[in-house]
């Protein structure tokens, strides 16, 4: 299948150790969970928990597994075919604009606004004007009403692997 090119560091090149299974490439490519040998004649398995590949490929290295940062929780571990899935801790979120770090969710909405969306691992609380219903732009308000936000549940992978 088609592959999303993840931007992980490469694992150090693996010479086939005894635990690394070898198989022949199919039509010149290797299946998920493997990389190709330098001579193109073998597919060598990635190392569980260390590196991975998500799609049919001719990678000479498997891709290094992501380690969740402090401030993140690991939702699912790295396997030979899927990268680690990390999620911001409760009360924090990761914006598309700044995916490198989790930011604290606001604790409440500015005066004259009402909360319509909770803090989730990928978005801050959402506030709208009471009368007009227009969204608040997201800048930190000078005065806040104390509206408690609750964390969302869906997973947000820290490295999407297609």
């Amino acid at each position: 299948e088609s592959a999303l090119i993840t931007q992980q560091d490469l694992a150090p090149q693996q010479r086939a150790a005894p635990q690394q299974k070898r198989s022949s490439p199919s039509e010149g490519l290797c299946p998920p969970g493997h990389h190709i040998s330098e001579d193109g004649r073998d597919c060598i398995s990635c190392k569980y928990g260390q590196d991975y590949s998500t799609h049919w490929n001719d990678l000479l290295f498997c891709l290094r597994c992501t380690r969740c940062d402090s401030g993140e929780v690991e939702l699912s571990p790295c396997t030979t075919t899927r990268n680690t899935v990390c999620q911001c801790e409760e009360g924090t979120f990761r914006e598309e604009d700044s995916p490198e770090m989790c930011r604290k969710c606001r604790t409440g909405c500015p005066r004259g606004m009402v909360k319509v969306g909770d803090c989730t691992p990928w978005s801050d609380i959402e506030c709208v004007h009471k009368e007009s219903g227009t969204k608040h732009s997201g800048e930190v308000p000078a005065v806040e009403e104390t509206v408690t936000s609750s964390p969302g549940t869906p997973a947000s992978p820290c490295s999407l692997s297609g």
Epitope: E27, D39, L59
Partner: antibody, heavy 119, light 106 residues
């Protein structure tokens, strides 16, 4: 002599579609992994898509995934690139390229076909 | 993605000169580096693969070296037909290219 001849390029509007072809000769086409690589007007080279020798497996970079589809017809010795939802940044010369024997990189390229995305 | 930083972006040289072009990978790529020559309006032509192996028919004045992150293409004695643009490429993780080095006549 290895020969790769691309065709199908032209001027297309943003959001439009185009299908490129690459006719191969001088080697056993069905035995080789093939790719498309493009060269931007600034002369930057970018890998676009790869397909396995039998056509069963394909992969793409993020920049084109979901918009471009690589395919091949081994009976006709032809490689294709179907491009849709084209953007201005897809403007480039598109080359088809063969992955060499035991080298895991491109050894022969075609002469290229120019795709211009503009309104 | 692995970034390949090539230098210089252009250089002027005379026939008979020794020319060196360097390429630096943003992370270890082993020896999975190729060098290509491109002339105006033409397709890139493979010169070197596996960092130092000359492709079929490539004159021995072209030499590649390096491993890990630092790679060099050397033309020992520049010939008139060598004035062109040269690109490095890593192929350890998908394919990424350097920005090119244009070798011009001084």
């Amino acid at each position: 002599e290895v020969m790769l001849v691309e065709s199908g390029g032209g001027l297309v509007q943003p959001g439009g579609s185009l299908r490129l072809s690459c006719a191969a000769s001088g080697f056993t086409f069905s035995s080789y992994v093939m790719s498309w690589v493009r060269q931007t007007p600034e002369k930057r080279l970018e890998w676009v898509a790869t397909i396995s020798s039998g056509g069963s497996y394909t992969y793409y970079p993020d920049s084109v995934k979901g918009r471009f589809t690589i395919s091949r017809d081994n009976a006709k010795n032809t490689l294709y690139l179907q491009m849709s939802s084209l953007r201005a940044e897809d403007t480039a010369v598109y080359y088809c390229a063969r992955r060499g024997d035991s080298m895991i990189t491109t050894d022969y390229w075609g002469q290229g076909t120019l795709v211009t995305v503009s309104s | 993605d692995i970034v390949m930083t090539q230098s210089p972006s252009s250089l002027s040289a005379s026939v008979g000169d020794r020319v060196t072009i360097t390429c630096k990978a943003s992370q270890d790529v082993g020896t999975a580096v190729a060098w290509y020559q491109q002339k105006p309006g033409k397709a890139p032509k493979l010169l070197i693969y596996w960092a130092s192996t000359r492709h079929t028919g490539v004159p021995d004045r072209f030499t590649g070296s390096g491993s890990g992150t630092d790679f060099t293409l050397t033309i020992s004695s520049l010939q008139p037909e060598d004035f062109a643009t040269y690109f490095c490429q890593q192929y350890s993780s998908y394919r990424t290219f350097g920005q090119g080095t244009k070798v011009e006549i001084k």
